[in-house]
């Protein structure tokens, strides 16, 4: 029972113009050329939009005009391979226009650049954008598209859109407050933190339909449905995996209209049939479209049925498990994830998934045994050490988090990391161990029943970032490994790993630990990143520095940005101070 | 909620024929499984046979296997019991059950049911 449109259009363009008005359809057509093209100018892709909206209309009035019936891809492939630059600023992207469809927008996809080498973004003063935004609103929002979109290429777009208007809204209320920075600054920073926290959560999306396919897409679907709404039947649930998985296939794949599109439908089916789903849908389907379908994706789950009755009638005890797992493989094993993550909201999806999986390998070996339900019989025993695993290494990690607060918690997963793959690049390291970090601000403070879901399965979103920036530059086998082998035990995969004793220390270089003046005018996030790459490069040079050791460093460190950012003549004391830091550093490590 | 009602019972002859028919009504039963169970006089409830939901698995007791056959009708929304070959000992009153949200027969417990028909005799005698 798919809830999506079947019928054939003459003109998909025209159709998806009409559905989704010419507003989303502009920003959905800008957002997919800023990801495709990210080092192209603002206004290049202003007019390479303009000119597909103008093309959309004359189609819209004549669906049989000329091109009309061309596909999505074909149109916006087309007009990507105008670009004069095509060439020089792309280098052999550019080849992908010699490709016809699909396979070149496979190529396309290929070389979206997850660490493009773009600017940061830098705050303007708030006068100074709030008559830009003043000025001219539309510019001002589409400049926002752009630059989020060609930054972070894989993100969902219809969910930008609900950015967007969030910011223009933010615009809108703090330009005319009496206190404009008090009232706008605390509102992007929301924006900018939720913005890389929803791009990361669609990177894992797009990773797990590209690297792992479609049927590891829905396992994770399945589990996570069930958990929000375990009171909907399993037909239900897979009714909504499969129209969520074509929703996210489209966007990562770069139908950005069909996919926002798509997903408005959705939105609708699951508003219209919320008594069989779930009872906590009912102030989101009262909000409009944007915020209705991120409302959905964020609900809180629903509350269990009572009185379910035990898993081990139907999947352990059944003189049936052997015949339904033979029939019907994964409708079987959808069923026992259905009905294990239905009655686990406590547990990750990622662990959800391992049971699953030890369930799934378990009846492989037994169903061709001799006495199959012998061989079976206890499958449950095999979750326990499943289970206690991750529980205690959030216990563990919730301690030490609880000690250290959270910079010096990020510390120690950045010398824990660095150990185990000293080859990734330094400035991947801190990003990822700072990631990893936070999980114990963002998870610890909450009750043991959802910790582990909060814990784990945020883990799986910053490890998916290290997994992706790994990719484009692989420099760890040790990395390659935990990133392909597996996409559910990617974390259990780098909490084993150990000191990496085949890595050859780095050469020490003094520049690497010289600082200047600029580090007191930094805000104290960009100190506390100065800091932890210094600490980073020192386990590089000296892996086998014990926590003392590197704790005495860093304190002294510390102390040195301090005095000489309170001494009058700072740069002095950086340049004579330092000297004398590196070589007691050297001296303390034994470098 | 579903309401089931079971018809066709009768008297046969043993290697009679007979074809039950179960009309659920309330909810469609065509992504959920659905079995027969009968009880004979002074016995348990015992399954006979059940078709899986959305995947049309079927499941049959050793004593009926070969001889009975389970179908539904998905338009009318009613499950049907094709029995040949009866013997005496299929005497029983004859139960259709649902087991909502089961696209299969994970069990032949009839505790795992929910919903139940008033039953349709069966008496196969000369």
């Known amino acids: 029972r798919g809830v999506f449109r079947r019928d054939a259009h003459k003109s998909e363009v025209a159709h998806r113009f009409k559905d989704l008005g010419e507003e989303n359809f502009k920003a959905l057509v800008l957002i997919a050329f800023a990801q495709y093209l990210q080092q192209c100018p603002f206004e290049d892709h202003v007019k390479l939009v303009n000119e597909v909206t103008e093309f959309a209309k004359t189609c819209v009035a004549d669906e049989s005009a000329e091109n009309c019936d061309k596909s999505l891809h074909t149109l916006f492939g087309d007009k990507l391979c105008t670009v004069a630059t095509l060439r020089e600023t792309y280098g052999e992207m550019a080849d992908c226009c010699a490709k016809q469809e699909p396979e070149r927008n496979e190529c396309f996809l290929q070389h979206k650049d997850d660490n493009p080498n773009l600017p940061r973004l830098v705050r303007p003063e708030v006068d100074v954008m709030c008559t830009a935004f003043h000025d001219n609103e539309e510019t001002f929002l589409k400049k926002y598209l752009y630059e989020i979109a060609r930054r972070h290429p894989y993100f969902y777009a219809p969910e930008l859109l609900f950015f967007a208007k969030r910011y223009k809204a933010a615009f809108t209320e703090c330009c005319q407050a009496a206190d404009k920075a008090a009232c706008l600054l605390p509102k992007l920073d929301e924006l900018r933190d939720e913005g890389k926290a929803s791009s990361a959560k669609q990177r894992l999306k797009c990773a797990s339909l590209q690297k792992f396919g479609e049927r590891a897409f829905k396992a994770w679907a399945v589990a996570r449905l069930s958990q929000r709404f375990p009171k909907a039947e399993f037909a239900e649930v897979s009714k909504l995996v499969t129209d969520l998985t074509k929703v996210h296939t489209e966007c990562c794949h770069g139908d950005l209209l069909e996919c926002a599109d798509d997903r408005a439908d959705l939105a609708k089916y699951i508003c219209e049939n919320q008594d069989s789903i779930s009872s906590k849908l009912k102030e989101c389907c009262e909000k409009p479209l944007l915020e209705k379908s991120h409302c959905i994706a964020e609900v809180e789950n629903d509350e269990m049925p009572a009185d379910l009755p035990s898993l081990a009638a139907d999947f352990v005890e059944s003189k049936d498990v052997c015949k339904n797992y033979a029939e019907a493989k994964d409708v079987f094993l959808g069923m026992f994830l259905y009905e294990y993550a239905r009655r686990h909201p406590d547990y990750s999806v990622v662990l959800l998934l391992r049971l699953a999986k030890t369930y799934e390998t378990t009846l492989e070996k037994c169903c061709a045994a001799a006495d199959p339900h012998e061989c079976y019989a206890k499958v449950f025993d095999e979750f326990k050490p499943l289970v206690e695993e991750p529980q205690n290494l959030i216990k563990q990690n919730c301690e030490l988090f609880e000690q250290l607060g959270e910079y010096k918690f990020q510390n120690a997963l950045l010398v824990r990391y660095t150990k185990k793959v000293p080859q990734v690049s330094t400035p991947t390291l801190v990003e990822v161990s700072r990631n990893l970090g936070k999980v114990g601000s963002k998870c610890c403070k909450h009750p043991e029943a959802k910790r582990m879901p909060c814990a784990e399965d945020y883990l799986s979103v910053v490890l998916n970032q290290l997994c992706v920036l790994h990719e484009k530059t692989p420099v760890s086998d040790r990395v390659t490994k935990c990133c392909t082998e597996s996409l559910v035990n990617r974390r259990p995969c780098f909490s084993a790993l150990e000191v990496d004793e085949t890595y050859v220390p780095k050469e020490f270089n003094a520049e690497t630990f010289t600082f200047h003046a600029d580090i007191c005018t930094l805000s104290e996030k960009e100190r506390q990143i100065k800091k932890q790459t210094a600490l980073v490069e020192l386990v590089k040079h000296k892996p086998k520095a014990t926590k003392e050791q590197l704790k005495a460093v860093m304190d002294d460190f510390a102390a040195f940005v301090e005095k000489c950012c309170k001494a009058d003549d700072k740069e002095t004391c950086f340049a004579e101070e330092g000297k004398k830091l590196v070589a007691a550093s050297q001296a303390a490590l034994g470098l | 909620e579903v309401q089931l009602l079971e018809s066709g019972g009768g008297l046969v002859q043993p290697g009679g024929s007979l074809r039950l028919s179960c009309a659920a009504s309330g909810r469609t039963v065509s992504s959920t499984a659905v079995a027969w169970f009968r009880q004979a006089p002074g016995k348990e409830r015992e399954f006979v046979a059940g078709?899986?939901?959305?995947?049309?698995?079927?499941y049959y007791a050793d004593s009926v296997k070969g001889r009975f056959t389970i179908s539904r009708d998905n338009s009318k929304n009613t499950l049907y019991l094709q029995m040949n070959s009866l013997r005496p000992e299929d005497t029983a009153v004859y139960y259709c059950?649902?087991?909502?949200?089961?696209?299969?027969?994970?069990?032949?417990?009839?505790?795992?049911?929910?919903?139940w028909g008033q039953g349709t005799l069966v008496t196969v005698s000369s």
């Open positions: 078709i899986g939901g959305s995947v049309d698995i079927t």
């Open positions: 059950a649902v087991r909502p949200g089961r696209p299969l027969i994970t069990s032949r417990d009839a505790n795992l049911y929910d919903y």
